[in-house]
């Protein structure tokens, strides 16, 4: 209710002789600040005096004086909310009730706190989860209802007296709600920890033992088993007996059922700790183990590999790969079930023993057609020799062999003839399915392996065929030896090497690229006129008049061929120069007079030069010289010079007469 002072603190605090006690405490006074505080030990109210009697452990008054003997007890609070206390060291006779007598200006209050001080350090308390299972992580908690700032302690975990290597997390609480020290240890117990003793040890700051608590671990786990076999190596022959025994080395809780497994599958009606196998067969070879269950689950023993030995079974042959391509590598594998594994093999090709082949595998690095056939083998171990199996068939595939191209026509062949060829071969695996021909052309194949060339070309020199199955085999090319008229006839200038100038010695050659047969005749013509019958046409001194269009002809027994017309160009310096005048050689002053330099030249004139009657050069570079306005003093003889890459030529003088205009005459 509102007439009470409000306090918060732990109800009871625990400590031991020589340690200390720290009392966290808060309060709220009814009115104003605290004016007086007395800490009593086992206070009792005296009705006569209306005061409390008892041992005064601490006293603080308005003047703030504190008796010197009170150093052991300290009030760490304040005048309005904190009432924390410290007793250091604490003694056995401090046990009992502490009374906090508080007085404000108008109000009083007595707050009681229990203090339990033991003679020796009291033990911590270990807390375990309700059930511990192997390999499942659990948290072990060690709790001590003590903590004090002036007295440091530590909690250490031990397993069978040996410090545990897992890291523990220690926490402390010094609050108005609780005072404790706690250590938590995360731990994954194994079945071997079952029954082991775990200790939480309380130590002082120097690691000196103060007290401890111990628990015995109850680790639930599946049965742990050992398997024993007779004979110990578990290797027997068909017809022998085998005994296997299962022993439980540990189980928590107790086991309930027993069973046996072979290659992971349960054996029916085998529910005892002993498995007896009489007159074993090879099928009983395998991995055996026993399985024992409890409430946690099943436990399995290690596996025992039982080997029942027997002579090789009839063998089979595996071929990598068939069909095989000629030239490739092939591997044969002899497969035969046997225990122990076969130590020797005998190989057969088409029923005949293959000498020197005693391994499980036979490798042929380069297969040839004669390697085809049936391959079989026999396996042998210490218990005997197996039987030869049915064998496997090797198919060797190869391109067509000995391919030839054959001409069916009578020889010789002429350009334009129809030619028939056939493609022949000796053997093939698989069968030939198509044919190819080189070079490719728009030719017809009237039947498989036959080629017909209509209108054979002059340049159809050779033909080759290929017979194809999965691969193509090409025959050597066969020469058609086609006969034809001369080809690519052309006129070629032999000399001079550069352009032809007037007066040069000139030789023209009639060239052709090929002719079959090779014997030929030549003919030269210009403008339809026959000039000669040699391969060359010669001019000792060429003149511009020899320029023109020339052709040559070449013929053989098949036909004749003409060249393209070839233009003979003769270069010469400007000639036949003359100066023409427009509008005429007599012009009236003030008008325009145009002088033109006319010439015959090859190449054309590239540069003109003009001169007057005193051979003075005039500053004009064109074919035409325009005088506008023309003056009387311009009257006189003019001449021009033309220049091309061959040389120069000059005109004769041409006279220009400029006469006075009527206006000028009138002024005189």
């Amino acid at each position: 209710d509102s007439s009470k002072w409000v306090f918060e603190h732990p109800e009871t605090l625990y400590a031991w002789e020589g340690a200390c006690v720290w009392i966290p405490c808060t309060y709220r006074a009814l009115d104003g600040d605290l004016e007086s505080f007395i800490l009593f030990h086992n206070p009792e109210y005296n009705k006569n005096t209306s005061k409390f009697d008892g041992t005064r452990l601490y006293e603080s008054t308005k003047d703030g004086k504190v008796p010197s003997e009170q150093k052991r007890v300290q009030f760490l609070g304040d005048k309005n909310k904190n009432c924390t206390l410290s007793i250091h060291p604490v003694h056995l006779n401090d046990s009992g009730q502490l009374g906090l007598r508080m007085e404000s200006k108008t109000e009083k209050w007595m707050e009681r706190i229990h203090l339990n001080v033991s003679e020796r350090p009291f033990p911590p308390h270990i807390q375990l989860p309700p059930e511990i299972q192997e390999s499942q992580e659990v948290t072990l908690t060690c709790l001590l209802n003590f903590s004090c700032y002036g007295y440091p302690i530590q909690l250490q975990w031990l397993l069978e007296g040996v410090p545990m290597r897992q890291a523990a997390v220690t926490s402390t609480s010094l609050t108005i709600k609780s005072v404790f020290t706690r250590s938590e240890l995360k731990f994954s117990p194994q079945w071997s920890h079952h029954g082991k003793i775990v200790t939480c040890q309380l130590q002082d700051a120097d690691g000196k033992f103060l007290s401890n608590d111990t628990v015995q671990l109850n680790v639930k786990h599946t049965p742990k088993l050992e398997i024993k076999v007779t004979p110990s190596d578990a290797i027997v022959r068909e017809g022998d007996s085998v005994t296997m025994t299962c022993e439980v080395s540990s189980s928590n809780p107790e086991y309930t059922t027993v069973s046996w497994l072979k290659d992971g599958t349960s054996l029916k009606k085998q529910n005892t700790f002993t498995l007896n196998l009489r007159e074993v067969t090879k099928d009983q070879s395998g991995k055996y183990c026993c399985q024992v269950s409890n409430d946690v689950g099943p436990g399995r023993s290690e596996e025992v590999f039982l080997q029942v030995q027997y002579a090789p079974e009839p063998s089979t042959v595996q071929i990598l790969h068939s069909p095989a391509v000629e030239g490739s590598q092939v591997e044969f594998l002899c497969m035969s079930l046997a225990n122990p594994l076969p130590t020797n093999y005998t190989w057969y090709h088409n029923g005949k023993e293959m000498q020197g082949r005693t391994e499980e595998k036979v490798h042929i690095p380069k297969i040839l057609p004669w390697h085809a056939g049936t391959y079989s083998c026999v396996a042998e171990n210490i218990l005997g020799t197996g039987q030869r199996g049915p064998g496997a068939e090797l198919d060797v595939q190869y391109p067509p062999k000995k391919v030839t191209t054959v001409i069916q026509n009578p020889m010789p062949i002429r350009e334009g003839d129809t030619v028939t060829l056939s493609c022949n071969y000796n053997s093939s695996n698989p069968s030939v399915t198509r044919y190819e021909w080189k070079p490719h052309g728009a030719w017809e194949e009237p039947s498989l392996g036959v080629l017909k060339i209509q209108n054979v070309g002059w340049d159809n020199t050779t033909i080759a065929c290929a017979a194809c199955n999965s691969w193509c085999s090409w025959a050597s090319p066969v020469a058609l030896n086609v006969q034809y008229a001369p080809r690519d006839v052309r006129v070629r200038k032999i000399k001079p090497l550069s352009e032809i100038h007037s007066g040069n010695s000139v030789s023209l050659q009639c060239d052709f690229s090929s002719s079959h047969p090779k014997e030929v005749q030549f003919f030269w013509e210009k403008n339809g006129r026959l000039l000669g019958k040699e391969s060359q046409l010669n001019f000792d001194s060429i003149s511009p008049e020899d320029a023109g269009s020339y052709s040559c002809w070449v013929n053989n027994s098949i036909g004749q061929t003409a060249s393209k017309a070839w233009t003979l160009e003769v270069l010469y310096a400007p000639r036949r120069l003359r100066v023409s005048m427009s509008p005429g050689d007599q012009v009236m002053e003030g008008k325009s007079a145009t002088l033109t330099c006319e010439s015959d030249a090859n190449p054309p004139v590239s540069h003109y030069t003009w001169f007057d009657w005193n051979n003075q050069s005039l500053p004009y570079h064109s074919q035409k010289l325009r005088l506008e306005p023309v003056k009387v003093q311009h009257s006189g003889a003019y001449w021009c010079q033309g220049t091309n890459s061959v040389g120069k030529g000059r005109s004769p003088l041409s006279t220009l007469t400029v006469y006075y205009s009527p206006e000028t005459i009138g002024r005189r």
Partner: antibody
Framework: EVQLQQSGPGLVKPSQTLSLTCAIS??????????WNWIRQSPSRGLEWLGR?????????DYASSVRGRVSINVDTSKNQYSLQLNAVTPEDTGVYYC?????????????????WGQGTMVTVSS | QSALTQPASASGSPGQSVTISCTGT?????????VSWYQQHPGKAPKLMIY???NRPSGVSNRFSGSKSGNTASLTISGLQAEDEADYYC???????????FGTGTQLTVLT
């Protein structure tokens, strides 16, 4: 060193005659390897050749078709100078007028370029 | 007679090369080897830099060179310098009655 010195008015009224003189020093007008030219420059027409005069056995002159009929080039051999007369001028004739020499012989070969120029005269045609 | 065609402007950094083209017809540039090039600084008269396609007058730097192919002539300035910044004009003799024709001019800027 050949030098060309120009003289003449900078302002001419429309329809009047533009008259400029070019005095030559360091060369003779009678040289038979030179021609004496007039060129003008304006923002609208750029550089434009107007005409030339030269002496060989007699005096000759040539004119650009754009001004032929209203242009004449006169020579004064005694003063070694030549002049440009451009009649009936319009504002279109405004620009900088230059006299320039062409030397037609470079050693033994022909040549043709304006190798010496006058300083230029800015002529404005305006009323 | 139409003027010869030149690019309106060209530019280059100091030390670089720049080429200016001049395109005409077979009646002028293509017909004669009388192409010349002129440099003009503002307010000054043109100065002859190249004559007869590729010849250099004495006193002109050998950084200036000229060439011609068909109807197009070219001026190349190598190792550009700040003082090369100017207007450049080409000119050619022509077969028309207007005996000389000039180019439209190219303003060369030297970037700094």
């Amino acid at each position: 060193e050949v030098q060309l010195q120009q003289s003449g008015p900078g302002l001419v009224k429309p329809s009047q005659t533009l008259s400029l003189t070019c005095a030559i020093s360091g060369d003779s007008m009678l040289s038979n390897s030179d021609t004496w030219n007039w060129i003008r420059q304006s923002p609208s027409r750029g550089l434009e050749w107007l005409g030339r005069t030269y002496h060989r056995s007699t005096w000759y002159d040539d004119y650009a078709s754009s001004v032929r009929g209203r242009v004449s080039i006169n020579v004064d051999t005694s003063k070694n100078q030549y002049s440009l007369q451009l009649n009936a001028v319009t504002p279109e004739d405004t620009g900088v007028y230059y006299c320039a020499r062409v030397r037609l012989q470079d050693g033994n070969s022909w040549s043709d370029a304006f190798d010496v120029w006058g300083q230029g005269t800015m002529v404005t045609v305006s009323s | 007679q139409s003027a010869l065609t030149q690019p309106a402007s060209a530019s280059g950094s100091p030390g670089q090369s720049v080429t200016i083209s001049c395109t005409g017809t077979s009646s002028d540039v293509g017909g004669y080897n009388y192409v010349s090039w002129y440099q003009q600084h503002p307010g000054k008269a043109p100065k002859l830099m190249i004559y007869d396609v590729s010849n250099r007058p004495s006193g002109v730097s050998n950084r200036f060179s000229g060439s011609k192919s068909g109807n197009t002539a070219s001026l190349t300035i190598s190792g550009l310098q700040a003082e090369d910044e100017a207007d450049y004009y080409c000119s050619s003799y022509t077969s028309s009655s207007t005996l000389y024709v000039f180019g439209t001019g190219t303003q060369l800027t030297v970037l700094t």
